[in-house]
Interface confidence: low
Amino acid sequence: GGCVEVDSETEAVYGMTFKILCISCKRRSETNAETFTEWTFRQKGTEEFVKILRYENEVLQLEEDERFEGRVVWNGSRGTKDLQDLSIFITNVTYNHSGDYECHVYRLLFFENYEHNTSVVKKIHIEVVDKANRDMASI
């Protein structure tokens, strides 16, 4: 199937599971590639981006960070090193998850006579709201 880059939702509900979308399509679908991703996070009210995970060779490596331990689930491409969907779930969202996320996509493209490295960063700002506010907003 075709790859379409879709922006992530930006409003997460406290206590619920939230999917942060990161889709990075290859420019030419027929080109073979290997891709890995690193996600970084800057919590609302802080200055520093901190790496929270790396996904490479079908292995999810979580950094030590109590805000995310046991809460991050890979929801991107599976069964391939040629990742185009690099999305994650955060389960049981708390207010500590409000802030700026960066999905860093590192791709090695294999051409007939050479290899080419590319990188792109997808930026996602997430606000965590309580369920009552979310319900009121939908009225």
Partner: nanobody
Framework: EVQLVESGGGLVQAGSSLSLSCAAS????????MGWFRQAPGKEREFVAR????????YYTDSVKGRFTISRDRAKDTVYLQMNSLKPEDTAIYLC???????????????????WGQGTLVTVSS
């Protein structure tokens, strides 16, 4: 205030195993990420291993990966360092340390740890 007490050190032969324990009085260890460091005679104190509050995430220095295992028992409020295939270069005073921060940056740095034990001596003879 947290007082940390290490135990389990001793003199062993190269290739053997030893298990170190770190217990606390004052405040529960479960509220801290815990690290083990070591200091050999005449050398800088160096990071060995770290375990997060929940016990889900661990870090090791390259020289002990595959030989040492850090773990924690929340019920006993104790942190352990299981050391296998010991080498003479593992000889040092081993100290446990408690870190209240949840930010993972610089987990191996001494100055980010809030409380330290006095240490237990591990001597590995060849």
């Amino acid at each position: 205030e947290v007082q940390l007490v290490e135990s389990g050190g001793g003199l062993v032969q190269a290739g053997s195993s030893l298990s170190l324990s770190c217990a606390a009085s004052g405040r529960a260890l479960s509220t801290y990420a815990m690290g083990w460091f070591r200091q050999a005679p005449g050398k800088e104190r160096e990071f060995v291993a770290r375990i997060s509050r929940s016990g889900i995430t661990t870090y090791y220095t390259d020289s002990v990966k595959g030989r040492f295992t850090i773990s924690r028992d929340r019920a006993k409020d104790t942190v352990y360092l299981q050391m296998n295939s010991l080498k003479p270069e593992d000889t040092a005073i081993y100290l446990c340390a408690a870190d209240a921060s949840t930010n993972p940056a610089g987990y191996y740095l001494r100055n980010r740890y809030d409380y330290w034990g006095q240490g237990t001596l591990v001597t590995v003879s060849s």
